[in-house]
């Protein structure tokens, strides 16, 4: 069975084809080659000499037991080598020779017992080394790491490391890898020698499910003293053994670390006193809790110095009391419990993401809801009922506003967005909005992107609601049940580049409403019910138009529509996916491509 | 279409078939077997994925006695610092994991329950596997 040609001469997918040897019938120019799940078993020298241009090579689960000297010798352009799931028993000292451009080496689940004997010291370009799910017992970073000056990611998770000693990290003192991210999760740790991490700088350190008791956790974290880390991730996994006890003593040792960003990811334990628990983390710039249960919600009004707070997939008894003077970014998404939003006091806040919480808002939105006048980004998407009772007074700095898939009430009772002269992006898609008031978008003089798919209009008619949106470049009106539009609906949109009118209910096509759209590049009218043109004589679309989508409509391919069908043919260079432009009627023409019709008036005379 | 038996409990019998062409082997054990009136137990899965499990989600198509429920999407792996350790599993890496589950207080009517589980993962998204579970429910059987 041949390999699948994904990109001609470049990318070949040869997965699970029962190959016992490397195929020799692929082009020299191949850059990406997936040979995974083939029983190759043995890689001799110059195994890939036929592929000098190779950049990505996937050898996952190839039953490889032996890799000889120079197996990859000809691959000077290879940047990614994947060896996952091979039961390697014999790895020659020169196994990886010739890989002068290698940036990513994945040797997950390859029976690797030690880094010491892993012959990669010459791979100076290496950025990412993944040796997770192996049998490594010692965390001693061999001397050759001093050559790996570009290393940014080292994944040692799911190994057998129990202890870390001062000598293990000596090489990092000699050549500090300032950007190194280290993952030690799922190693059964019970001892970190105090001082082992002293004066070590890491970009990120991840320690999840490393400790089988609170005491071990406490002493190991104390062993991290002196570490300077940009981002520290602690926690557990839901499907692994979890701590039976967790209290404030667990994290006391963090006071002796310098941490910029902290994240606690999954804890099968109720956090009841976060002030004491995170006492050593009051001054990190970013604080994040993922998948934890928080009992006392008022603790978030303590004077933490965080600039970014992230609460994701957590459980709360009620919406937390948030009073944080220095907070600039708040991400509160996919949480459970506390379905009603209550006011927060965050005077420095610029970025607020409250999406996917099923929250309801009794009144939205003004400065008093969020306790700030600095807000630039507000995401309230995928929530419950949001009743619009104020038009963003005090929130005039907003540039990005997203309500998609929430249920907006009172949208047509006043000019909701009147204050938002700085707003650039607005998404009110699928918000049950029924446009019944022409001033709905008044005030949005800077708006560039407007998404309002999946709503509806009074009498299925698009009126002149865009008159003030002179900077608009993107407009999505798909799935709005539209049947008719004002001839002047788009007259003020001279900057508009993309207009999506798909999935509406137009029976005919008219070019007249688009005559003023001098910048229009994309017009999508797919999935309507267009049978013919509105007027016999269709004008040209604006000369800027590059893509016109008329697919999946109901073209009536009879003689009476000859001029319309000819007009469509004349637009051929603009049309996309022409093969999906088919006749719907009459029955003998049904399914025929419109462009292949010979439009003569022999048709159904 | 070969049917794979999972287990029997006092009120349910569970089996599955593959609903994709590939039929990559997957081993599923439930201990103790699910009882629909209330249940607590461990689900053990052994599987070698044909693509990374990053951003894994399930599309669930449930049929209750021939009545179709709306499609449900269950996100399992968001993409970073996920709840489950197998979310970091790579293509070709052995996934051998035990997940605890519990539910209570749901009354199910007697009959045949079908659940098509479409597992989607990776970027770009592609199907990882598709299994159709059949649960025969006898509420009053001993």
């Amino acid at each position: 069975e041949p390999c699948v040609e994904v990109v001609p001469n470049i990318t070949y997918q040869c997965m699970e084809l029962n190959f016992y040897k490397i195929p020799d019938n692929l082009p020299f120019s191949t850059k990406n080659l997936d040979l995974s799940f083939n029983p190759l078993r043995h890689l001799g020298s110059y195994s890939f000499f036929s592929f000098p241009e190779l950049q990505v090579l996937d050898l996952s689960r190839c039953e490889i037991q032996t890799i000889e000297d120079g197996a990859y010798q000809s691959l000077s352009h290879l940047s990614t080598l994947i060896l996952t799931g091979n039961p390697i028993q014999s790895l020659a000292l020169g196994a990886f020779s010739g890989l002068s451009s290698l940036q990513k080496l994945v040797a997950v689940e390859t029976n690797l017992a030690s880094l010491e004997n892993f012959p990669i010291g010459h791979l100076k370009t290496l950025k990412e080394l993944n040796v997770a799910h192996n049998l490594i017992q010692s965390f001693k970073l061999p001397e050759y790491f001093s050559n790996l000056t570009n290393l940014e990611h080292l994944d040692l998770s799911s190994n057998k490391i129990q202890s870390i000693y001062c000598t293990d990290l000596r090489v990092l003192h000699q050549m500090p890898l300032l950007n190194l991210s280290l993952d030690l999760s799922l190693n059964p740790m019970n001892f970190i020698q105090p001082g082992a991490f002293k004066e070590i700088r890491l970009h990120k350190l991840t320690l999840r499910n490393n400790f089988d008791s609170l005491n071990v956790m406490k002493t190991c974290i104390q062993g991290l003293a002196g570490l300077e880390v940009h981002r520290l991730v602690l926690g557990e996994f839901r499907n692994e053994g979890n701590l039976e006890k967790f209290d404030k003593s667990a994290l006391e040792g963090l006071c002796n670390l310098t941490i910029e960003e902290f994240r606690l990811a999954y804890l099968d334990y109720y956090l009841d006193d976060i002030i004491d628990l995170f006492n050593c983390l009051t001054n990190v710039s970013s604080f994040s809790l993922v998948s934890v249960t928080i009992e006392r919600v008022k603790d978030f009004s303590y004077n933490f110095g965080w600039q970014h707070l992230e609460l994701v997939n957590c459980k709360f008894g009620q919406f937390p009391t948030l009073k944080l003077k220095s907070l600039k970014r708040l991400t509160f998404t996919s949480n459970k419990g506390g379905n009603a939003f209550s006011e927060v006091d965050l005077p420095s806040l610029e970025f607020l993401d409250l999406s996917r919480n099923g929250l309801s808002f009794k009144g939205c939105c003004s400065q008093s809801d969020f306790g700030t006048t600095s807000l630039k980004y507000l995401d309230l998407s995928f929530n419950g009922v949001i009743t619009m009772s104020s038009n963003f007074l005090g929130l005039e700095q907003l540039e990005h506003l997203d309500f998609q898939h929430s249920n907006l009430k009172q949208m047509s009772e006043f000019s909701v967005f009147l204050s938002l002269r700085n707003l650039i992006y607005l998404d009110i898609s699928h918000t049950h909005t029924r446009v019944a008031f022409n001033g709905i978008f008044n005030g949005l003089s800077s708006l560039e992107v407007l998404k309002m798919a999946g709503n509806s209009f009074q009498e299925n008619f698009l009126p002149d609601i865009f008159t003030e949106l002179r900077n608009l470049t993107f407009l999505d009106l798909s799935q709005c049940q539209l049947e008719q539009l004002s001839p002047t609906a788009f007259n003020s949109l001279s900057s508009l580049q993309v207009l999506n009118m798909s999935h509406n209910n137009f029976f005919s096509l008219d070019t007249f409403p688009y005559k003023c759209l001098n910048s229009l590049q994309v017009l999508d009218y797919s999935l309507n019910h267009i049978m013919t043109s509105k007027k016999q004589e269709l004008q040209h679309f604006p000369s800027s138009l590059a893509f016109l989508n008329l697919t999946q409509n109901d073209f009536a391919c009879t003689c009476e529509h000859q001029s319309f069908l000819q007009w469509i043919k004349d637009q051929r260079q603009l049309l996309v996916e022409v093969e999906r432009m088919e006749c719907a009627t009459p029955s003998d023409k049904q399914g025929m491509p419109v462009l292949s019709l010979n439009i003569t008036c022999q048709m159904n005379k | 279409q070969k049917q794979y038996w999972v287990c029997n409990s006092s009120d349910a019998s569970i089996s599955y078939t593959y609903c994709d062409k590939m039929q990559y082997p997957i081993s599923i054990n439930v201990n103790p077997c699910i009882e629909l009136k209330r249940s607590k137990g461990l689900l053990h899965i052994f599987y070698i994925p044909r693509r990374d499990l990053k951003q894994l989600y399930f599309n669930l198509y449930i049929t209750v006695n021939t009545m179709n429920l709306p499609k449900r999407k269950e996100v399992i792996c968001r993409g970073s610092d996920d709840d489950y350790s197998f979310c970091r599993a790579l293509k070709g890496e052995t996934v051998n994991t035990t997940i605890s589950f519990s539910f209570k207080g749901i009354k199910f009517s007697k009959g045949k329950y079908k659940c098509v589980v479409e597992a989607i993962s990776g970027s770009p998204e592609e199907m990882l596997f598709c299994l159709e579970f059949v649960i025969l429910h006898q509420p009053n059987s001993n």
């Epitope: 049940q481 049947e483 008719q484 | -």
Partner: nanobody, 119 residues
Framework: EVQLVESGGGLVQAGGSLRLSCVAS????????MGWFRQAPGKERDIVAR????????YYAESVRGRFTISRDNAKNTVYLQMNSLRPEDTAVYYC????????????WGQGTQVTVSS
């Protein structure tokens, strides 16, 4: 499952009128487009008229424009075709058609009703 049942066909003199009715059962089709097709002997089936769920948009084939009127009563789940000034060339089987609630065109069809216009 949606069923469409037409009625009102028959024999009529040229210049006369008929009113076709189509009742939908099985589910409400108040939001979907409905229409009438016809098939004359030895000819292809082709669209005559179409109406949107809201009744705002209508379409007529050129050959019937000004003579036929399509309308609907969503409360009764019924669509009508009022045919005036009938001509012999209007003789055909007339079919009621409805889109699917998901928006797929011409998804459901009736069995048809015969209209014969004698000269």
């Amino acid at each position: 499952e949606v069923q469409l049942v037409e009625s009102g066909g028959g024999l009529v003199q040229a210049g006369g009128s008929l009113r076709l009715s189509c009742v939908a059962s099985g589910r409400s089709l108040s939001t979907v487009n409905m229409g009438w097709f016809r098939q004359a002997p030895g000819k292809e089936r082709d669209i005559v008229a179409r109406i949107s769920g809201s009744s705002i948009s209508t379409y007529y084939a050129e050959s019937v424009r000004g003579r036929f009127t399509i309308s609907r009563d969503n409360a009764k789940n019924t669509v009508y075709l009022q045919m005036n000034s009938l001509r012999p060339e209007d003789t055909a089987v007339y079919y009621c058609v409805a889109d699917s609630p998901g928006g797929r065109s011409y998804e459901f069809w009736g069995q048809g009703t015969q209209v014969t216009v004698s000269s």
